[in-house]
């Protein structure tokens, strides 16, 4: 159910592309394709290629992305395209000009002097942004989200975008300076992962990150369980980055117990993050427990 045909506007297309990219990534990282047959992988790659091709129709001359060709470009959507395309680089041919042009736009057009990334054209499909929706810690959450995307594109774009390392540092400075004031577990988790990627989740910040966990196994706010799955996935990635393998097992157990296999309305971020985090876990954690995740691969009929 994760392999779907992407279609629609620049936002819907990314909603459609997400599950296929993350499913292929997960099965590649965990070496599970023999369960499904390698021909299924080929079919999935064709769908990713379609999604990529379609997304280019929503790329603007500035290299940013929008829902429609004449709509103002979105910071969040452009950062998300960067994130998904960075993961897909190992799967299909992606033009580095497309990816790094988007990175450049984010830095030059949307980053303020204090390091914050601003959104001037919010996405239409608010359900696709996950826990960032109605987040009263928006500057921190969006800056963390964009920063994570930039870091995932770093190896690909460092040579083409001279301002990338400085931009990452500036955004990290902002997150670090404001981290201790955060109230929402979601923002603690996403900003925690962004800082952990930079090796800056330390001391009191690390303490806050760890103590925010409920029962030492989940990062949870009142409200949608989908957002808690997403937040806990960010937190798991942070823990893996920190190599805190004592804290990891209960978190993985909790994620596994949610029996969350992705798909469905509003699931874009939770789907992407849970599979990214669990793939990373199976790759990084020594003697990791085998996860029995139900990834069903039904290729859409042509």
């Amino acid at each position: 159910h994760l392999i779907v045909t992407p279609s629609g506007c620049g936002e819907q297309n990314m909603i459609g592309m997400t599950p296929t990219v993350i499913a292929v990534h997960y099965l590649d990282e965990t070496e599970q394709w023999e369960k499904f047959g390698l021909e299924k992988r080929q079919g999935a790659l064709e769908l990713i290629k379609k999604g990529y091709t379609q997304q280019l129709a929503f790329r603007q001359p500035s290299s940013a992305f929008a829902a429609f060709v004449k709509r103002a470009p979105s910071t969040w959507l452009t950062a998300y395209v960067v994130k998904v395309f960075s993961l897909a680089v190992n799967l299909i041919a992606i033009d580095s000009q497309v990816l790094c042009g988007a990175v450049k736009w984010l830095i030059l057009e949307k980053q303020k002097p204090d390091g914050v990334f601003q959104e001037d054209a919010p996405v239409i499909h608010q359900e696709m942004i996950g826990g960032l929706r109605n987040n009263n810690e928006k500057d921190m959450a969006l800056t963390a989200f964009v920063l994570i995307s930039l870091q995932e594109a770093k190896d690909i774009c460092e040579e083409q975008v001279n301002s990338l390392p400085g931009s990452i540092t500036k955004a990290g400075d902002f997150l670090e300076a404001n981290y201790m004031n955060l109230q929402r577990s979601y923002t603690v988790a996403i900003a925690g992962y962004a800082l952990a990627q930079m090796g800056r989740l330390k001391g009191p910040l690390l303490n806050k990150f760890l103590t925010t966990a409920k029962d030492k196994n989940r990062w949870e706010d009142p409200g949608k369980q989908l957002y808690n799955v997403e937040a806990t996935s960010y937190a798991l990635l942070a823990l893996l980055q920190l190599k805190d393998f004592d804290f990891v097992p209960p978190v993985v157990r909790w994620l596994n117990e949610q029996r969350y296999y992705g798909g469905g309305y509003g699931s874009t971020q939770a789907t992407f993050m849970v599979f990214q985090a669990l793939a990373q876990y199976q790759k990084d954690a020594p003697d990791h427990q085998e996860l029995n995740l139900d990834v069903s691969l039904q290729l859409p009929s042509r």
Partner: antibody, heavy 120, light 110 residues
């Protein structure tokens, strides 16, 4: 920079027919190419498109009836099982710009067209 | 679907406009392009991206979008005999979906 279609002829219904569009002065690794047709006395009708990464899309009515493929210098349109309704002049057109600057998604270089007649 | 009037006419030197109505979706979201086609010839672009003229196309040709009527318009001023042709609008809804209007026949009278 130009494109030219060839392969149009009279065929009987059900006989597969392949039209070829030969491009010169530009590379198919930098441009998407589209096929458009025009029945006698009728309007233009978009059939489908092929992108530099070989991804193809078709108009909903054209799916299954046409196949677009390419080599380094040609783009083919195969009419899988022609009917009399497929009688038309078939044009090949270049889509400006790849990868995807949205402001340039239109057809800017057209071939003169090739006439296909389907009749028993 | 893009709907165009079947025919319009104008006298030499006059101004004519023709419309291209978007029946589904919001025209503000998509670019509209206009093509001129003389009998037996291939189409040529006269306007792209709503209101842009390719080089070589005289400034007598202009394009516009009207959000309230959800339609695009092609206007030709100072009509010449050579402007007599069929005109088609095209919209690229996304990279996998292009739609032509039915076409408008322009007749130029003396």
């Amino acid at each position: 920079q130009s494109v030219e279609e060839s392969g149009g002829r009279l065929v009987t219904p059900g006989t597969p027919l392949t039209l070829t569009c030969t491009v010169s002065g530009f590379s198919l690794s930098s441009y998407a190419m589209s096929w458009v047709r025009q029945a006698p006395g009728k309007g233009l009708e978009w059939i489908g498109i092929i992108y530099p990464n070989d991804i193809t899309y078709y108009a909903s009515w054209a799916k299954g009836r046409f196949t677009i493929s390419k080599t380094s210098t040609t783009v083919d349109l195969k009419i899988t099982s022609p009917t009399t309704e497929d009688t038309a002049t078939y044009f090949c057109a270049r889509v400006v710009s790849w990868p995807g600057y949205t402001t340039e998604y239109y057809f800017n270089i057209w071939g003169p067209g090739t006439l296909v007649t389907i009749s028993s | 679907v893009l709907t165009q009037p079947q025919s319009v006419s104008g006298s030499l030197g006059q101004t004519v406009s023709m419309s291209c109505k978007c029946d589904s979706g919001n025209i503000d979201n998509y670019y509209v392009h206009w093509y001129q086609q003389h009998p037996g010839k291939a189409p040529t672009t006269v306007i792209y991206n709503d209101d842009q003229r390719p080089s070589g196309v005289p400034d007598r040709f202009s394009g516009s979008i009207d959000s309230t009527s959800n339609s695009a318009s092609l206007t030709i001023t100072g009509l010449l005999a050579e402007d007599e042709a069929d005109y088609y609008c095209l919209s690229s809804v996304s990279s996998d979906n292009y739609v032509f209007g039915g076409g408008t026949q322009l007749t130029v009278t003396g």
